[in-house]
Interface confidence: medium
């Protein structure tokens, strides 16, 4: 997260760290007791490493009573996701067992009504991604509030040049932005999960390159079918 600040500890009980061989790789969001939603591209970076999900964390390194690392029983990328595009960049991870819920570990309701979030709406994005262009990684969860950007502006030739589909949404990126390591994390608007940070190699913090998020409402049928 660029231009953000440290999050209130455990105030986002849905927040997950998707880890490979014990290292943070991507963000994720607990959407049901045994399921975490993340970005499909995260799996590409996992290679053959052991994928696990950390829940109930604020600090990645420090012991915390609510922290627990879960093995992954099943990884389900969206069937249409491809390495060369950010389309359908969603991944569902089934935990080895149901998460133990409490104040610091709780699923987040996700948007099922397929309607664009109003431009200008402030949404919360959080993650353990880099906090500087030099690549500094935080130990504690960071967050930032970002205004939603209308799709027409986001698709301008000077911005993303038509790449933003109806199944994506954009947020402003003027010095405040999601970045590398935040992919798969939640964009929360009004207490509801609206978007998942896409995992492209986009430049961060440049207002001409807005943040791109996969709209979960557009994938409600797929999410429901996997969770069923």
């Amino acid at each position: 997260i660029l231009g953000g600040r440290e999050a209130e500890a455990h105030a986002r009980p849905y927040m997950a760290s998707v880890q490979v061989n014990g290292e943070h790789l991507c963000g994720g969001v607990l959407v049901a007791e045994q399921w975490v939603l993340s970005a499909a591209h995260c799996l590409e970076d996992a290679a053959d490493g052991k994928v696990q999900v950390l829940l109930g964390a604020h600090s990645l390194s420090q012991p915390e009573p609510s922290k627990r690392l879960y093995d992954v029983l099943r990884a389900v990328p969206h069937p249409d996701s491809r390495p060369d595009t950010i389309d359908h960049d969603l991944l569902l991870l089934q935990l080895s067992e149901k998460a133990t819920l409490g104040p610091a570990v709780r699923p987040l309701p996700w948007q099922r009504v397929d309607r664009d979030v109003e431009p200008g709406t402030l949404c919360d994005v959080a993650g353990w991604g880099i906090v500087s262009h030099a690549g500094r990684r935080p130990d504690r969860l960071q967050h930032v509030l970002l205004p939603v950007l209308d799709r027409a502006t986001c698709n301008r030739r000077t911005h993303h040049d038509g790449a933003i589909t109806q199944r994506m949404m954009c947020a402003e990126s003027n010095r405040r932005d999601s970045c590398k390591g935040d992919s798969g994390g939640p964009l929360v608007c009004g207490g509801v999960l609206e978007g998942v940070v896409t995992s492209g190699s986009r430049v961060c913090g440049n207002r001409k390159k807005p943040g791109i998020y996969t709209r979960v409402a557009s994938y409600a049928a797929w999410i429901d079918s996997v969770l069923a």
């Epitope: 986002r12 819920l101 402030l122 919360d124 929360v188």
Partner: antibody, heavy 121, light 107 residues
Amino acid sequence: QVQLQQSGPELVKPGASVKISCKASGYSFTDYYINWVKQRPGQGLEWIGWIFPGSGSTYYNEKFKGKATLTVDKSSSTAYMLLSSLTSEDSAVYFCARTGYYSNLYAVDYWGQGTSVTVSS
Amino acid sequence: DIQMTQSPASLSVSVGETVTITCRASENIYSNLAWYQQKQGKSPQLLVYVATNLADGVPSRFSGSGSGTQYSLKINSLQSEDFGNYYCQHFWGTPYTFGGGTKLEMR
């Protein structure tokens, strides 16, 4: 300390509109939702919707779309609810109430004292 | 929309007794539930948040429990100031509906 001070009782005619206010103090107004809740005499509570003063974003219970309009004035830390095309069904006490934005206290922790609206010819 | 079914609708009890009020959600709300007390002519007051956590200043005779779709509020050794109306409310996506309420009256 946190306070939500609502405007006084209103007696209005059917078909008219009324705007009730809720002045917040003792906390950062732009960091919390303001919810509005309806309670008819002797009845339970109905959630009308919320507004996030930081952005002006609103969300309405479908039942109250077109009936209630939520706004804020950040400069005076005041939230407003406009009720339009009033009928006797709108006679009720209306509460404003605060919810955390990114706290894990997913609950209404402070309430206004309520504003009574009576619709009568 | 999620429906919250609260029971019983009313309860007639004496000081010192223990009472339990229940709330059933029409789908799993993952502990995103609050309980409120409302006295006649007053605003509701928060008692419990996230199903089991007591709000500041709430006496320890109150306790919340439950998970999934079933939740309860228990009041041990009822005091005279505990009589009034009780409501549950879910926070699992909007609209944040309330239960129908339970009226706790003195026998």
